[in-house]
């Protein structure tokens, strides 16, 4: 498939309003067609032409002037004015405010918990899995195997630290060099970035804020990916991570600290340790090939024990095999040995869900990740809700300039690095990227936080995730001090050399624009967001990781093939996009193409046809429920949980409205969908009394 | 209590073979080892062999090996010495003994079997 | 095999006195050893074993100490019961193999 989701030169048609043509249209909307249907804050509702209700691709007819989807949308605050209340109106107003706050924090508290389930839920369904990942012993030779690895790993227990624990107790027992960690490391470091990827998916339901808060979470997807794709060749060829990380370990005489501040943790735990418990040892033990470990259950049933090391006697073969000449005895027949073991008597059973139910760690995993995401997506719902009904007007103008505006001139590029500073603060406040960098994905869904500001927040995060496992590997125990704090180095220095490849020069934000660039594309097919999450997160690295196993030469004889037509393309369009002449006519653009190779459209009707019926059912499903939650907020008008629903009633409503024909989407370029030419936002009713 | 009950005294001629008994009674027999000890007149103790009435393994001292053989019956809970090509040197009292578990001590001793080798 | 040399062959003592009773082994034997007590005419007794523990029924004024090669038997006060022949054992390795015998008589 060619790099972008359509390619072509062909103009649109000028006679259609489409969803993607931004630019300036030659006739204005047919006034016939425009309603003054109104929601809850009596602003016209401009009537959209439906395609079939299940198309994922909704035709807009769009006003004249041009909007940059990427421009934060201005939130209208349709209440009183403080000013204009009355002292009853005022309290009530503070009350309000308040209990707002409350229920923000709480559904935080409770968002942050879900992320904390979600990854003992993908413990449990992936983690022995991904332990015997680690078993694989090509990873010591192949950098690239230890990179989807790491990539794996940490996508299966949804937890960088769980698999850099690994790396570190597996570098302490000799199992694994540094060298053969570094890649690990960094595929960790990619598998991290899947989290508030999730988080953004559940923002699916409103177009403009799924853009935006998909591209604020892939923004650190691609800046992972793109510093894997320049470091570990460069790691690969001057080792210049282990060689920096190895001089720093041994030019300082490091003592053993404390253990890194649980913040976050301690308001978290009570809650989620009454859901369930994990003895993460497990995976570990699995990583280091320990056979009894492989039948050991993940949940944790005793959670108060007693060690006691005693010495048995022990029969063996011969005196060569005791313990020592001193402890070596016969009974006249056997040779005996006093062996050294630790006898564990369980006192005190966990006290969590899961405890009796004895049930196999799949069952478990597959019900808390069910039920994490459930409470994660609506936890997510009623916290852009909330942000919404706060951030309007004054307020919301308020906090956007004070976080995306820059210092004054000649200081205005230090505001990145202060962000960077912020970002690494904040996560070593929560001690996790993840749970920041997913607070941060609703936030520039909503429009609060632009992507160019979150990018180095972003940036500030992977770097604060590495403080802390550095301030954890100088809690290790003596034996494991070294290997930890080497790698927690490692770890350290490759985001900041990442931040040094993709973020000092304006022009190297890669990142920014390819994070961008999969906004406008998911906004329009949304289903693509999921395929780029399955296809990056999941295949390519089990693809790399199957031909890895087959050998060398297959990997070399697939991927160089694969890496030659990638490189081949990118020249291609960077040719066509700069110098277009160079090329012979039939290169100048991708009609040459058959259509499915060259846009995504074949595709959405494929995709369509399955989801459609689906999507009406759980349309219906959602309304109902819509409605049975706007009776119980007391609602004017019935709220409406997403763009799908919406589309379903207005189709129901206005029965009138000629649908467009699908054959209106035959031209439209890659030019216009990869730059965003899309609504910049949908219709969206609020339920104010919130 | 814990017994071990001998054969009776035994008058042999050299190069002849004697067979003599230790029954136990008291405890499992097939969960300890049992010994067997010779003591000449006068003189110390030797230790001969041993055998596990559980499975049948048998070890000895290279000195009686061949000369010695033990058999344990686990029916009757009885152990069993029959030394063969007795010499006058074999004439001395024998002893069985239970070895404790998991180790080589000897906590309790038959009364002892007295043999002579006498042409 | 291991040797187990006993001294003193013969112990003269009196009712009331502290006797020891040295057992050197040819190698280190750890604690693999076991003391015996044998009356005349009568079959041997399990007194202690590794080196120091006393078997059941054992009167305390019996103890051992020592381990590796040099091992001590101490009776803390001689009873006229005591009068008998006392072995050393190892049982570190096979064959087992006792000490000479130390007797102990009234003087």
């Known amino acids: 498939m060619a790099p972008w989701p359509e390619l072509g030169d062909a103009q649109p048609n000028p006679d259609k309003y489409l969803e993607g043509a931004a630019g300036q249209q030659p006739t204005a909307p047919d006034k016939s067609k425009e309603t003054n249907k109104t929601d809850n804050t009596e602003a016209p509702v401009t009537k959209i032409e439906l395609l079939p209700s299940y198309s994922t691709a909704t035709l807009i007819d769009e006003p004249t002037e041009v909007d940059d989807p990427w421009n934060l949308p201005t939130l209208q605050d349709s209440g009183i004015k403080w000013s204009e209340r009355d002292t009853k109106g005022k309290i009530l107003c503070f009350f309000q405010g308040i209990g707002r706050l409350i229920l923000l924090l709480g559904f935080l508290y409770f968002f942050v918990c879900s992320l904390d389930i979600l990854s003992s839920a993908f413990q449990l369904v992936g983690g022995k899995m991904a332990g015997q990942f680690f078993s694989n012993s090509s990873i010591m030779s192949n950098p690239l195997l230890g990179l989807v690895i790491g990539v794996l790993v940490t996508v299966l227990v949804q937890s960088s630290s769980t698999s850099t624990s690994i790396v570190v107790s597996m570098v302490s027992s000799s199992l694994l060099t540094v060298r053969a960690a570094i890649p690990i490391i960094m595929g960790a470091n990619i598998g991290t970035s899947i989290t508030n990827t999730i988080v953004a998916l559940m923002q699916v339901g409103d177009r403009s804020e799924f853009r935006r808060a998909f591209a604020g979470a892939t923004v650190h997807d691609f800046f992972n990916w793109l510093s894997v794709l320049v470091l570990l060749p460069v790691e690969v060829a001057t080792h210049y991570l282990e060689i920096i990380t190895q001089l720093i370990v041994e030019s300082f005489h490091f003592k053993n600290g404390e253990d890194a501040p649980d913040l976050l943790k301690v308001i978290t735990k009570p809650f989620t340790k009454l859901i369930v418990q994990l003895d993460k040892k497990v995976i570990s033990q699995i990583a280091m090939n320990d056979e009894k470990a492989k039948n050991k259950s993940l949940v944790k049933i005793w959670c108060k024990t007693f060690t006691n090391k005693t010495q048995i006697n022990v029969t063996v073969p011969s005196t060569a095999n005791c313990t020592s000449p001193s402890l070596c005895w016969t009974d006249g027949i056997q040779n005996w040995t006093m062996k050294n073991v630790t006898y564990k008597e369980n006192i005190a059973k966990c006290q969590h869900i899961f405890v009796n139910f004895h049930l196999p760690d799949l069952a478990v995993g597959t019900i808390l990740l069910i039920l994490s995401l459930l409470v994660l997506c609506g936890c997510l719902i009623m916290i852009v809700k909330i942000l919404g009904s706060v951030l309007k007007g004054q307020v919301a103008t308020v906090i956007k300039k004070t976080i995306n505006t820059d210092f004054p001139f000649p200081f205005a590029w230090l505001t990145g690095y202060l962000a960077i500073l912020v970002g690494a603060g904040m996560t070593f406040i929560v001690q996790s990227s993840s749970v920041f960098t997913s607070a941060l994905t609703p936030l520039i869904g909503i429009g609060v936080i632009t992507i160019e500001r979150a990018y180095p927040l972003t940036l500030g995060s992977n770097i604060g995730t590495t403080t802390t496992a550095i301030l954890a590997a100088l809690a290790s125990p003596g034996n494991a001090l070294r290997s930890s704090l080497q790698i927690a180095l490692c770890h350290f220095f490759f985001n900041i050399s990442g931040i040094l490849l993709w973020y000092p020069i304006p022009f190297t934000r890669l990142p920014i624009r390819m994070a961008k660039g999969l906004g406008n594309i998911s906004a329009k097919y949304r289903w693509f967001a999921v395929f780029y999450l399955i296809i990056f997160f999941f295949l390519i690295p089990l693809t790399v990781f199957g031909l890895s196993l087959a050998g060398w030469r297959v990997l070399v004889g697939v991927g160089v093939p694969v890496v030659f037509i990638i490189i081949l393309v990118l020249c291609l369009r960077l040719l066509q996009s700069r110098c277009p002449r160079v090329l012979p006519k039939k290169l100048q653009n991708w009609n040459f193409l058959p259509l499915w190779m060259r846009s995504l459209k074949p595709w959405d009707a494929v995709v369509s046809k399955f989801t459609g019926c689906f999507q009406m059912r759980c349309c219906c499903c959602c309304r109902v429920c819509c409605r049975a939650c706007c009776l119980l907020c007391d609602c004017p008008k019935c709220c409406r949980c997403s763009k799908c629903c919406e589309d379903l009633e207005e189709a129901q409503e206005g029965q009138d409205v000629p649908v467009k024909a699908p054959e209106t989407f035959d031209n439209i370029t890659i030019s216009r969908e990869a730059q965003g030419e899309v609504p910049a936002s949908d219709s969206k009713t609020e339920c104010t009394a919130l | 209590q814990v017994q071990l009950v001998q054969s009776g005294a035994e008058v042999v001629k050299p190069g002849a073979s004697v067979k003599m008994s230790c029954k136990t009674s008291g405890y499992t027999f097939t969960t300890n080892n049992m010994h067997w000890v010779k003591q000449a007149p006068g003189q110390g103790l030797e230790w001969i062999g041993a055998i596990y009435p559980g499975s049948g393994a048998t070890a000895y001292n290279q000195k009686f090996k061949g000369r010695a053989t033990l058999t344990a019956d686990k029916s009757t809970s009885t152990a069993y010495m029959e030394l063969s090509s007795l010499r006058s040197e074999a004439t001395a009292v024998y002893y069985c003994a239970r070895g404790m578990y998991g180790h080589g001590a000897m906590d309790y001793w038959g009364q002892g079997t007295s043999v002579t080798v006498s042409s | 095999d291991i040797q187990m040399t006993q001294s003193p062959s013969f112990l003269s003592a009196s009712v009331g006195d502290r006797v020891t009773i040295t057992c050197k082994a040819s190698?280190?034997?750890?604690?693999?050893v076991a003391w015996y007590q044998q009356k005349p005419g009568k079959s041997p007794k399990l007194l202690i074993y590794?080196?120091?523990t006393r078997h059941s029924g054992v009167p305390d004024r019996f103890s051992g100490s020592g381990s590796g090669t040099e091992f001590i038997f101490t009776i803390s006060s001689v009873q006229p019961e005591d009068f008998a022949t006392y072995f050393c054992?190892?049982?570190?390795?096979?064959?087992?193999?006792f000490g000479a015998g130390t007797k102990l008589e009234i003087k």
């Open positions: 190698q280190d034997v750890g604690t693999a």
């Open positions: 590794w080196a120091t």
């Open positions: 054992q190892q049982y570190s390795s096979n064959p087992l193999t």
